[in-house]
Interface confidence: low
């Protein structure tokens, strides 16, 4: 239904608090370098304007689109050219090109300082002094570092952030109460950001058909009792929500997500028996809960898939009549029967089925041609099963840190041109698949592991896209969304790589390493490991292990020394010399 004023419509639907929070997120995701105070000023101006439109929808400029209003507001920033360079050229464009231009300048790896957590008392004082500013600052800092963060979900995180401070700043031991909660929010937030980044990449790089296929498979696994028409309706609505959020239309996205949650809860009898608890919660919690809800039980009496999709004489007729509907039904029927498969595997199977029908429906005897199509699925299913089995065995044998190191070596040898920080970040995240998924029984391992790996490899793809250095990464990232993981798995050592020159500075360490947290110390060691492999890509596992063991002993020894800095300087030289000898550098 058309509204005279879109901004008034969204203000009334969302309420002032959510409206302001979402506009702040939108602005911070576009202008990631702007100071907090500047954004707050812009948001207040937009909010005041929205209120005039609520009072009189016919008032001047109230009929303008949100992109026009927000874009005009962003283009008033005085330092746009100095701070953002060519992004300022966006302001010379008209909508919708201007918004597309802003979207293209979103930076997945902005040059922003690491967020340092102040002392608990300092944070509690700031929280009590001005709760609203404190929470806005949280939204701002997360949004500018994660320009594709799912905005309505960020509101949910902010609500939990507020609850943590409200509870813990009154506790006897504030730190014991607060710090674990903040750690949990940080880790969940990073995971949420990465998952949403994959959804946006899927929509933006591979189109809505790819996203819809993913959604059909996932929702069919989650709601196996729902009819195909019901799943289709949810897929259409979910696609709209994510297209809006990925496109920077955060007010529409949040509004439509709320409508979708409302619809799901009003129709839970025909969707899933697992939604009852979610639907009793307030809006933000409800939407989050629905998004994470466990798979419903499969109907007991599902017939064989072969009847409709292989044995029927009408397969080609049905396919020709409406290809995407028929393939959608195939994906729905296969996915609801296989909660034990990853979504990407289900999509590979659907792609194989589609390719077979394209070929066979043009053949002299179509039925004869596609009769064995399900046999082609076997190797596709076994490949991730075997890979997960092998890697879980390795993880159980090594533990997380050493498993990450094994992956660091593996991936550095595959794509040594990629920057060291990216290789460390991605390999550490790949390594977390072990503790995340290997504990699960067989039936849950593949959906956990392979769909998680898709999220992590997408991080590699978006970081690499910003500064492309490897044709192999580009190829694996762009050829097929569902075959990214098999593509990377299949890469061997890059024989064309010219080893990096040895630089002693890279392997010079100082006493400051002793005061780092265990995690940060690991990252330092893993950074050194990547650099070692870049210098000596042909080094064996045994050689690398020996050097890393020596390195760990060196750090431990010097951190216990009275004169730490001297120890690092002198012992460090010896370590570098010994490592060069061991690796033949």
């Amino acid at each position: 239904d058309a509204h005279k004023s879109e901004v008034a419509h969204r203000f009334k639907d969302l309420g002032e608090e959510n409206f302001k929070a979402l506009v702040l997120i939108a602005f911070a995701q576009y202008l990631q370098q702007c100071p907090f105070e500047d954004h707050v000023k812009l948001v207040n101006e937009v909010t005041e304007f929205a209120k005039t439109c609520v009072a009189d929808e016919s008032a001047e400029n109230c009929d303008k689109s949100l992109h026009t209003l927000f874009g005009d507001k962003l283009c008033t920033v005085a330092t746009l050219r100095e701070t953002y360079g060519e992004m300022a050229d966006c302001c010379a464009k008209q909508e919708p090109e201007r918004n597309e231009c802003f979207l293209q300048h979103k930076d997945d790896n902005p040059n922003l300082p690491r967020l340092v957590r102040p002392e608990v008392d300092v944070m509690c004082t700031a929280f009590h002094d001005n709760e609203e500013t404190f929470l806005k600052k949280y939204l701002y800092e997360i949004a500018r570092r994660h320009p594709y963060f799912y905005a309505p979900e960020l509101l949910f995180f902010a609500k939990r952030y507020k609850a943590a401070f409200t509870e813990c700043c009154q506790a006897a031991d504030k730190a014991a109460c607060l710090l674990p909660k903040l750690d949990e929010l940080r880790d969940e937030g990073k995971a949420s950001s990465a998952k949403q980044r994959l959804k946006c990449a899927s929509l933006q790089k591979f189109g809505e058909r790819a996203f819809k296929a993913w959604a059909v498979a996932r929702l069919s696994q989650r709601f196996p009792k729902a009819e195909f028409a019901e799943v289709s309706k949810l897929v259409t609505d979910l696609t709209k929500v994510h297209t809006e959020c990925c496109h920077g239309d955060l007010l529409e996205c949040a509004d439509d997500r709320a409508d979708l949650a409302k619809y799901i809860c009003e129709n839970q009898d025909s969707i899933s028996s697992k939604l009852k608890e979610c639907c009793e919660k307030p809006l933000l919690e409800k939407s989050h809960c629905i998004a994470e809800v466990e798979n419903d039980e499969m109907p007991a009496d599902l017939p064989s898939l072969a009847a409709d999709f292989v044995e029927s004489k009408d397969v080609c007729k049905n396919y020709a009549e409406a290809k995407d509907v028929f393939l959608g039904m195939f994906l729905y029927e296969y996915a609801r029967r296989h909660p034990d498969y990853s979504v990407v595997l289900l999509l590979r199977l659907a792609k194989t089925y589609e390719t077979t029908l394209e070929k066979c429906c043009a053949a002299a005897d179509p039925h004869e041609c596609y009769a064995k199509v399900f046999d082609e699925f076997k190797p596709l299913v076994e490949e991730p099963q075997n890979l997960i089995k092998q890697n879980c065995e390795l993880f159980e044998q090594l533990g997380e840190y050493k498993f990450q190191n094994a992956l660091l070596v593996r991936y550095t040898k595959k794509v040594p041109q990629v920057s060291t920080p990216t290789l460390v970040e991605v390999s550490r995240n790949l390594g977390k698949v072990g503790s995340k998924c290997c504990k699960h029984p067989e039936a849950k391992r593949m959906p956990c592991a392979e769909d998680y790996l898709s999220v992590v490899l997408n991080q590699l793809c978006v970081l690499h896209e910003k500064t492309p250095v490897s044709d192999r990464v580009t190829k694996c990232c762009t050829e097929s969304l569902v075959n990214r993981r098999p593509c990377f798995s299949a890469l061997e050592v890059d024989e064309t790589y010219v080893p990096k020159e040895f630089n002693a500075e890279t392997f010079t360490f100082h006493a400051d390493i002793c005061t780092l947290s265990e995690k940060e110390r690991q990252i330092k060691k893993q950074t050194a490991l990547v650099e070692l492999v870049k210098h000596k890509p042909k080094a064996t596992k045994e050689q690398l292990k020996a050097v890393m063991d020596d390195f760990a002993a060196f750090v431990e020894k010097c951190c216990k020394a009275d004169d730490k800095e001297t120890c690092f300087a002198e012992e460090g030289k010896k370590l570098v010399a010994a490592s060069q000898a061991a690796l033949g550098l």
């Epitope: 259409t236 995407d324 509907v325």
Partner: nanobody
């Protein structure tokens, strides 16, 4: 409810050109196939041209080489460029969008008249 609105029809001399446009009132997320159809005086409605979401096109034999179907995804608009028009091309031209998850949509039609 999404509406389709055709425009660009009119009266043209034989051998002339017209460009029809079909605009959707809002973004349609589940397009499967887009097409132009026509209904000449006293005739059944017939297919003129189709385009898939992957931009594969197909044409009725009678218009091959003369008509070109295209779409502008960002503007939610379907086009039909008609060159070398003939009197037998006269009729009411409709656009249709077949959808994956919803019933198909038809426009209300735009009249094309080719005089000899």
């Amino acid at each position: 409810e999404v509406q389709l609105v055709e425009s660009g029809g009119g009266l043209v001399q034989e051998g002339g050109s017209l460009r029809l446009a079909c605009a959707a009132s809002e973004r349609i997320w589940d397009i499967n196939l887009l097409g132009w159809y026509r209904q000449g005086p006293g005739n059944e409605r017939e297919l003129v041209a189709t385009i898939t979401v992957g931009d594969s096109t197909s044409y009725a034999d009678s218009v091959k080489g003369r008509f070109t179907i295209s779409r502008d995804y960002d503007k939610n608009t379907l086009y039909l460029q008609m060159n070398s028009l003939r009197p037998e091309d006269t009729g009411l031209y409709y656009c249709k969008i077949r959808r994956t998850w919803h019933s198909e949509l038809w426009g209300q039609g735009t009249q094309v008249t080719v005089s000899s």
